[in-house]
């Protein structure tokens, strides 16, 4: 490589300057325009509308001189709506009369089709606790829960666990503060990512895997309403409810003793397929070693705030970084795959599809995934979720950005860290990190309350810019958080994952685990191997820092040893000990299942809050297994084997 | 074919009230929204009023709220325009204009009707 | 209130190409649509979302928007285009027109 020499070198300064300077004169709001205009739009996964957008971002990516660009097919199978309407009736017990309330004009996809009738209990946000609070049993009665807090798929589980016989949805005036009360919206209740009739493994056509089904799948029906439905419904139930859920006014709690409420649903399943575009910049030192820049395409409504700003700012994002490469020199070490991604709308089926594919060799190649949708949902605060490996590219980028409107710099606390919210199931985020173990990141500009039209017929361009009339501004800035996140994790010879964070994470777990030493003393267990785990982490976190700064910055071969043991970290958080198929989302951390330490804290108190319900002999193999995964993230950040002490 | 066909425009003093109508046809009348655009004599259009497709929302320009109420029956396919306390600056063509689908949220008056003349005078 | 600027009058000659701008505050921002009306008719809409020709609209006719902004371009003039043109934007729930232009052909 004799032309090394004639590229002047580039630092930090010199590309956080260009990437700004090229965002200024980017025009944001005209490609999310364009993103909703009539031939694009609505653009349901697998439509002609979604596959019109396919071709165009493909083009995009082509016209942008990409090292390469593709696509992966996948044939999943979805649930849509029938042509026999879904529907919600009031009964009377005796069936002496009936009063359609709705056929609503929305749907959850992947509802289990029945029809079911009995009283109506509402139960809040359909958490956990909420139902715990109910004083109301809700076993063989259906339930209505209002939209937002945590996903549709999670309320179902819920109630589903509560022995409800079905689930109804809407959005209230207090929380959802839209106009008109007849609008109709969408989700799905699959509590998992990807196709659920191959859980754990990838839809690609010439894949003949025996039939299968996700056991996050629902077995109760569930439907959204209107708010106008609810209302009606309202009207035929009693008692106020709690003034601590701070909702509408017409809130009631429970069907009048002569009432009943029947939902039939009726949804079918259908084969579709769906393109997922790539394209690639690689890079100049170690191409197979790249970053993943991803949106979500696909959109049950018009999508402007769901799927046209994230896959604004991934063109935009493609363009800005193949200038910078291709017309002013900038040499990224490590590869950028730029990717659009459909199905999202069904649970990131195609993200979550394509780590499906690559599941033995993805995580040892890319090393970060930044999710840019619903990038842009306000102004006022900027929040994010991610892994703790990426908390100080993170703090520094945040130290870096101005905010759009304020000026001031994005990092106004320094205990954001503390304040950081888990990734969940609805974000693209979620299987990246908690079921291929590839530390990612997702964020966005947004306000204190939801933005409330996601999801809903309503979220159209024109919405969003009169609810953001800076929208140009505030996508910039986001373009600008995800580009500096992209230079500085291609660009630096030493990997930007901070392993060390994960220290922190250990001894938070540890302190809270120890609250219950007595327990465990009791049970004649000793926490004693997990601290040497423990230690063994952060012994090696420090000898990884210590070989970091003994070892020459030019030596190439040196630091992609370094970089590939740092690159493995999130990897090991994978437990071992559970198949990817039952548990896809291993992550001991953010993962989901009994093999989780929040699992293992949750199961643990019930020794002394509901003891029949403890399973000491699960416990013990939970502690087991922790600790030795803890351990083997240990060894793995040690290096080599004969490096390793044995003493454990 | 869609069609719209208004009626009820003439003479009434200021102060008066008169009501308008636009019989529909040739499409689903309740799943779109429907407008009122006036024209007065030698000027350009001005936008008076909006309806939902359900009726349950509607809009109006400042210069007729509080006097103009805009109403439909989705059941006779036909809109209405109630006005009162006529002024002389209400003098125009009214026109009652579909408001199409637009994926964007920006919804183009996409068929119009041939107008009604309603004068204001003493 | 949000308002739209038209010029009063365009003329052209026929075959030569006409172009009418709409101005307003951000304009580009927002979808903007126009409208053709010819004497003793009532308007009819030629262009949506900024460019979109419906059914039946000769391909002469053509519009852009950005900026501040909107353009109405009927390329080929013909003595059937003389007419007065409105443009037309959303804002917020209620909806605002230019105040036309007069197309003469000459």
């Known amino acids: 490589k004799d032309d090394d020499d004639k590229v002047p070198q580039l630092y930090w300064d010199d590309l956080k300057k260009m990437l700004s300077e090229k965002l200024d004169t980017t025009d944001f709001t005209s490609t999310i325009k364009l993103l909703n205009e009539n031939s694009y739009v609505p653009r349901e996964a697998g439509s002609q509308k979604d596959e019109n957008l396919a071709w165009y971002i493909e083009n995009q990516f082509r016209e942008c001189k990409l090292s390469k660009v593709w696509r992966d097919e996948h044939f999943v199978k979805i649930q849509v709506k029938d042509s026999a309407q879904n529907s919600v009736t009031i009964t009377g017990t005796n069936s002496e009369f009936v009063y359609l309330v709705e056929n609503p004009g929305g749907y959850v996809a992947y509802s289990q089709n029945a029809t079911v009738t009995g009283k109506l209990v509402h139960a809040n946000f359909g958490t956990e606790k909420d139902f715990e609070d109910l004083d109301s049993p809700v076993n063989g009665s259906l339930v209505i829960v209002r939209a937002g807090k945590i996903t549709f798929a999670e309320k179902v589980a819920n109630a589903e666990s509560a022995n409800a016989i079905g689930v109804l949805i809407y959005m209230d005036k207090t929380k959802f503060p839209i106009v008109d009360a007849d609008v109709s919206f969408f989700g799905h209740a699959h509590l998992g990512t990807g196709d659920p009739y191959t859980p754990g493994f990838p839809s690609f056509n010439h894949t003949q895997f025996p039939p299968s089904r996700s056991s996050g799948l629902p077995n109760i029906p569930v439907q959204t309403i209107s708010r106008a439905a609810a209302e009606r419904l309202f009207e035929n139930m009693e008692g106020d409810c709690p003034s601590d859920w701070k909702t509408d006014s017409s809130c009631r709690m429970v069907t009048s003793q002569n009432k009943s409420v029947k939902l039939s649903v009726s949804n079918v399943m259908k084969e579709i397929k769906i393109l997922n575009i790539f394209g690639v910049i690689k890079g100049f030192v170690e191409p197979d070693r790249y970053v993943v820049v991803g949106a979500q395409r696909d959109s049950w409504g018009p999508g402007a705030a769901k799927s046209s700003v994230g896959t604004a700012l991934l063109l935009e994002l493609a363009q800005t970084f193949s200038d910078m490469v291709l017309k002013d020199g900038f040499q990224p070490s490590r590869s950028i795959v730029f990717a659009s991604w459909s199905a999202g709308d069904f649970g990131s089926v195609g993200a979550t599809e394509w780590l499906e594919g690559y599941l033995s060799s993805l995580h040892l190649k890319a090393f970060t995934f930044i999710n840019l949708d619903k990038a842009v949902l306000g102004t006022s605060n900027f929040r994010v979720s991610a892994s703790p490996l990426l908390y100080a590219l993170i703090e520094k980028t945040m130290q870096e950005v101005k905010h759009p409107v304020t000026g001031l710099s994005l990092y106004q606390d320094s205990n954001w860290a503390s304040k950081v919210e888990k990734l969940t199931f609805d974000n693209a985020a979620f299987p990246f990190l908690a079921y291929s173990g590839i530390p990612a990141v997702s964020f966005c500009f947004c306000e204190d309350t939801d933005y409330p039209y996601l999801g809903t017929t309503m979220d159209t361009y024109k919405e969003l810019i009169e609810k953001i009339p800076q929208l140009n501004k505030v996508a910039r800035a986001a373009a600008e958080v995800a580009g500096q996140f992209m230079i500085k994790l291609t660009h630096d010879v030493e990997l930007n994952l901070d392993y060390e964070r994960y220290n922190s994470q250990l001894l938070s777990f540890l302190r809270n685990l120890n609250q219950y030493r007595a327990d465990i003393r009791e049970m004649g267990l000793s926490l004693q191997w997990l601290y040497s785990a423990r230690g063994d982490f952060f012994r090696a976190t420090s000898r990884l820092t210590t070989d970091f700064k003994n070892s020459e910055k030019t030596d190439r071969f040196v630091m992609k040893e370094l970089n590939d043991r740092v690159m493995k970290v999130e990897y090991y958080f994978l437990s071992p000990y559970v198949s990817p198929r039952e548990s896809p989302f291993r992550h001991i951390f953010w993962g989901s299942g009994s093999h989780t330490l929040s699992a293992l804290l949750e199961h643990l108190k019930l020794r002394k809050t509901n003891n029949r319900a403890f399973n000491e002999t699960l416990f013990r193999n939970q502690l087991a297994l922790a600790t030795w995964t803890i351990q083997g993230a240990a060894n793995a950040l040690s290096g080599d084997i004969w490096d390793i002490d044995n003493e454990f | 074919e869609v069609q719209l066909l208004e009626s009820g425009g003439g003479l009434v003093q200021p102060g008066g009230s008169l009501r308008l109508s636009c019989a529909d046809s040739?499409?689903?009348?309740?799943?779109?929204?429907m407008n009122w655009v006036r024209q007065a004599p030698g000027k350009g259009l001005e936008w008076v009023s909006g309806?939902?497709?359900?009726?349950?929302?509607?809009y109006y320009a400042d210069s007729v709220k509080g006097r103009f109420t805009v109403s439909r029956d989705n059941s006779k396919n036909t809109l209405y325009l109630q006005m009162n306390s006529l002024r002389a600056e209400d003098t125009a063509v009214y026109y009652c204009?579909?408001?199409?689908?637009?994926?964007?949220?920006?919804?183009?008056?996409?068929?119009w009707g041939q107008g009604t003349q309603v004068t204001v005078s003493s | 209130s949000y308002e739209l600027t038209q010029p009063p009058s365009v003329s052209v000659s026929p075959g030569q190409t006409a172009s009418i701008t709409c101005s307003g505050d951000?304009?580009?921002?927002?979808?903007a649509c126009w409208y053709q009306q010819k004497p003793g008719q009532s308007p009819v809409l030629v262009i949506y979302?900024?460019?979109k020709r419906p059914s039946g609209i000769p391909e002469r006719f053509s519009g852009s928007n950005s900026g501040n902004t909107a353009t109405l371009t009927i390329s080929g003039t013909q003595a059937m285009d003389e007419a007065d043109y409105y443009c037309?934007?959303?804002?917020?729930?209620?909806?605002?027109f230019g105040g036309g232009t007069k197309l003469t052909v000459l």
């Open positions: 204009a579909r408001e199409g689908y637009d994926s964007s949220g920006y919804n183009p008056f996409d068929y």
């Open positions: 040739g499409f689903t009348f309740s799943s779109y929204a």
């Open positions: 309806i939902s497709g359900s009726g349950g929302h509607t």
């Open positions: 951000k304009l580009g921002d927002k979808y």
């Open positions: 979302q900024d460019s």
């Open positions: 037309q934007a959303w804002d917020s729930s209620t909806v605002v």
